[in-house]
Interface confidence: medium
């Protein structure tokens, strides 16, 4: 399977909410011995590989923001901890998963990575990620709402297997 990022850049005004989205394309293994783990984290544009460094989003680590289930089930993060930080990650039945950030500040700007790990117990782990940039702007040049820029087909398939 692949992870695609429909949008590679989100430009948003301070105070707005933003929902960053990733999409799983292709078959994901199903069965009692398969676990799908999805999460989000901040990273930097590493020289070797994007998304290798894992930094917290609003002090929440990728472990705090994970979604964890078998197959393509819908899921949400534990609401209490994430919502206290104005965050919510969610997943639907169609391979889409997202993180919503409320009341954006300039400090939220950065490179966001979504991570999917397919665990086939007793066999292997397959790790895939996608990356997108969030720019939070303030002042007269800031847009009134979030403006999103579609990924080129080449950029949107950021595939890393493990």
């Amino acid at each position: 399977f692949k992870v695609t990022t429909p949008y590679s850049l989100y430009v948003c005004p301070e105070g707005q909410n933003a929902t960053l989205t990733c999409r799983i394309l292709g078959p994901v293994s199903k069965g009692h011995d398969v676990t799908i783990y999805k999460t989000w984290y901040l990273s930097s544009r590493g020289e070797v590989q994007m998304c290798s460094e894992r930094r917290p989003i609003r002090n929440l680590t990728f472990q705090d923001l994970h979604l964890h289930h078998g197959g393509h089930q819908a899921a949400n993060t534990s609401h209490d901890l994430a919502q206290r930080h104005g965050l919510e990650s969610a997943s639907d039945h169609h391979g889409n998963f997202s993180i919503t950030m409320r009341n954006l500040t300039l400090l939220d700007s950065g490179l966001y990575c979504c991570l999917v790990v397919e665990i086939r117990h007793h066999h292997s782990e397959h790790r895939v990620h996608g990356a997108m940039e969030l720019q939070v702007q303030t002042g007269k040049d800031a847009p009134s709402n979030c403006v999103v820029y579609p990924s080129s087909s080449q950029d949107s398939e950021n595939i890393t297997a493990a």
Epitope: H32, D33, T35, Y37, T39, V48, S52, R54, F62, Q63, D64, H66, H68, G70, S78, L115, V117, I119, H121, H122, H123, S124, E125, R127, T160, A161, A162
Partner: antibody, heavy 118, light 106 residues
């Protein structure tokens, strides 16, 4: 503060079985897998297996199937490893360690020393 | 299973000296992880995903590599770095560790 507190050292007789506990605190127990690692004679590390407190799912190193049984008690955030039909080869230090999927074992228990001797 | 071979098995270095140890995998792995263990203590995560420092790890440590060949480097040896270092892979079951490199201070 993240902590993994393991049960104390054990001296057991050959052929007996025993259970080691690993009590987790300071983090969401169901958000990680709990892994068990054997270290013999202060040298090589061997991965025994893992259990997901989220759904109770386990994965074992084939070498330890039938030797180790992993369980969890979510209500007390405790992982257990039972070692069966012990022999001198099982004398070692056993560690529990937490791991997030797609990551590494970032916190380890202090280790439980098991000595099998008649 | 994937066998990880570490070399050298034992090495010594003077304070301030650069140290490099290697980990060779019998099959290609996507990422390598490194742990440090001192006598009487539990292993400690040093490096994840081949080259990223775990929280609290000094900047003198670095990791690199790909495929079947990986290395851990200490830019300037310090006395507190004397320990045994293990590489480990999570790419395929069973997850395996290297046999360790024991680093001593001269």
């Amino acid at each position: 503060e993240v902590q993994l507190q393991q049960s104390g050292p054990e001296l057991v007789k050959p052929g007996a079985s025993m259970k080691i506990s690993c009590k987790a605190s300071g983090f969401s127990f169901t958000g990680y897998t709990m892994n068990w690692v054997k270290q013999s004679h202060g040298k090589n590390l061997e991965w025994i297996g893992l259990i997901s407190p989220y759904n109770g799912g386990t994965s074992y190193n084939q070498k330890f199937k039938g030797k180790a049984t992993l369980t969890v008690d979510k209500s007390s955030s405790t992982a257990y490893m039972e070692l069966l039909s012990l022999t001198s080869e099982d004398s070692a230090v056993y560690y529990c360690a937490r791991r997030a999927y797609g990551y590494a074992m970032d916190y380890w228990g202090q280790g439980t020393s098991v000595t099998v001797s008649s | 299973q994937i066998v990880l071979t570490q070399s050298p098995a034992i090495m010594s270095a003077s304070p301030g000296e650069k140290v490099t140890m290697t980990c060779s995998a019998s099959s290609s792995v996507s990422y390598m992880f490194w742990y440090q263990q001192k006598p009487g203590s539990s292993p400690r995560l040093l490096i994840y995903d081949t080259s990223n420092l775990a929280s609290g790890v000094p900047l003198r440590f670095s990791g690199s590599g790909s495929g079947t060949s990986y290395s851990l480097t200490i830019s300037r040896m310090e006395a507190e770095d004397a320990a045994t270092y293990y590489c480990q892979q999570w790419s395929s079951y069973p997850f395996t560790f290297g046999s360790g490199t024991k680093l001593e201070i001269k």
